[in-house]
């Protein structure tokens, strides 16, 4: 027989839930569907992930997103998590915004990003609502740097990158400083593959790094090299 009064709370149908913190008067809700649309746009050693909210919110407004990352080595095809080696623009779990930038990606590595949508009742089911996007990083190789010549007051430095990548580079940035002086440094920009650093101190070690500048931003930087000018007694013209 029907009760003379309505029930104070109703059991949820299968697939619908109330979170422990939900009041009994709240309607039953369910986990959201996956993020509707996910894009991964590579920019050098960065990827911008953007997505749109799930089409089905599950009847709740407390949707948050989590981003996870997997990297795969092209030579072997082996894959593994990459949380430890990448940097997110904000903590990748509990995101409320629908975009995040991932940086410090490695050249020539394949990455798969998973964006999961969750709400207050997602923890009550075992299934997950996620979408994935893959991207290959084609950041320029770090320049290979050589010391071509030196004098008491100058260092002649050259560098190379693989020919297929040269067309992507519009300039090279050469940063140098005296060894032991981390407070000041000098920067030279050039379109060529060599530079002579002048007005240096004799018999002094300089730290030199070359970085390619591309349309997408900075390419990978070279190693930091240590090059030493000649001492006055051992001087001759640009000799290595």
């Amino acid at each position: 027989l029907p009760s003379p009064e309505g029930a104070t709370s109703c059991e949820c149908e299968e697939g619908f839930f109330r979170a422990p913190q939900d009041p009994a008067s709240m309607p039953c809700t369910r986990p959201p569907s996956a993020p509707h649309y996910l894009t991964a746009v590579g920019m050098g050693a960065k990827v911008e992930l953007r997505w749109t909210p799930p089409q089905d919110s599950g009847g709740r407004e407390d949707i948050v997103y989590s981003v996870t990352c997997e990297q795969c080595w092209p030579e072997s095809g082996e894959c593994g998590p990459c949380e430890a080696s990448v940097r997110y623009s904000e903590p990748p779990h509990g995101l409320t915004r629908t975009s995040v930038t991932v940086s410090d990606l490695e050249p020539h590595m394949n990455y798969t990003f998973t964006v999961e949508a969750r709400n207050g009742v997602s923890g009550l089911v075992t299934s997950r609502s996620f979408r994935t996007a893959s991207v290959s990083i084609n950041q320029t190789e770090p320049p290979k740097v050589r010391l071509e010549g030196r004098s008491t007051t100058s260092l002649s430095v050259s560098w190379s990158i693989p020919p297929p990548q040269q067309s992507r580079v519009w300039k090279y940035e050469v940063t140098y400083r005296k060894k032991g002086d981390s407070n000041s440094y000098n920067v030279r920009r050039t379109e060529g593959f060599s530079v002579t650093l002048d007005d240096l101190a004799p018999d002094t070690t300089y730290l030199v790094q070359v970085q390619a500048l591309t349309q997408e931003g900075q390419g990978a930087g070279s190693k930091v090299h240590e090059f030493q000018t000649l001492s006055p007694e051992g001087s001759g013209n640009l000799a290595v």
């Epitope: 010391l147 060894k179 032991g180 930091v224 240590e226 090059f227």
Partner: antibody
């Protein structure tokens, strides 16, 4: 082929001074920056510092965490370098190694600070206990 | 001061590939060296300058380095590869040498 042989006292009391010496056989002594490294039992490697003697100039560089207590000196006539660590405590108990870098420090203007170590001494276990 | 982070342990079955990572801020701009150390012995250099092998080291040891992570790869792992592995760099900002905390490789 360069060889390193090290020696020194293995048992010390707290507040005493640790003293170890490393002899270099073969190779050009003045071309390299010679290092001391230690490893407490069951723990990782810790760089102590390095020394170079070229011409009449001694160059020293020490781990900041030990700098106030450590001295690395050179005897170029014997191709030897030595480690002294003052005011030792139980925390200084470790195996101490001397080590040679892979390459001369500078060659034709190209220098290698913090180079890889291709040759190590046999290690000396130093215990500090009262 | 510059910090190098290694996983405390890595386990791998014989014949498989082991990867040991060494993380550090912009480590790709530094030369990374790797050592193998077996119990009671001094460390042995297995890879220098990111990926070069000293003479006598088998080609199953290889290395790579870019971004914030350097990796030592040991292919076709054997029981004899069970050891502690350490990475090392020079921090040019402070002019000091730094070791990673070490990774114990266990062959299952």
């Amino acid at each position: 082929q360069v060889q390193l042989q090290q020696w020194g006292a293995g048992l010390l009391k707290p507040s005493e001074t640790l003293s170890l010496t490393c002899a270099v056989y073969g190779g050009s002594f003045s071309d390299y920056y010679w290092s001391w490294i230690r490893q407490p039992p069951g723990k990782g490697l810790e760089w102590i510092g390095e020394v170079n003697h070229s011409g009449s100039i001694n160059y020293n560089n020490y781990n900041p965490s030990l700098k106030s207590r450590v001295t690395i000196s050179v005897d170029p006539s014997k191709n030897q370098f030595s480690l002294k660590l003052t005011s030792v405590t139980a925390a200084d108990t470790a195996v101490y190694y001397c080590a040679k870098p892979l390459r001369p420090h500078c060659t034709n203007g190209v220098c290698y600070s913090g180079d890889a170590f291709d040759i190590w001494g046999q290690g000396t276990m130093v215990t500090v206990a009262s | 001061s510059y910090v190098l982070t290694q996983p405390p342990s890595v386990s791998v079955a014989p014949g498989q590939t082991a990867r040991i990572t060494c993380g550090g801020n912009n480590i790709g701009s530094k030369n990374v060296h790797w050592y193998q150390q077996k119990p009671g012995q001094a460390p042995v250099l297995v890879v220098y300058d990111d990926s070069d092998r000293p003479s006598g080291i088998p080609e199953q040891f290889s290395g790579s380095n870019s971004g914030n992570t350097a990796t030592l790869t040991i292919s076709r792992v054997e029981a004899g590869d069970e050891a502690d592995y350490y990475c090392q760099v020079w921090d040019s900002s402070s002019d000091h040498l730094v070791f990673g905390g070490g990774t114990k490789l266990t062959v299952l």
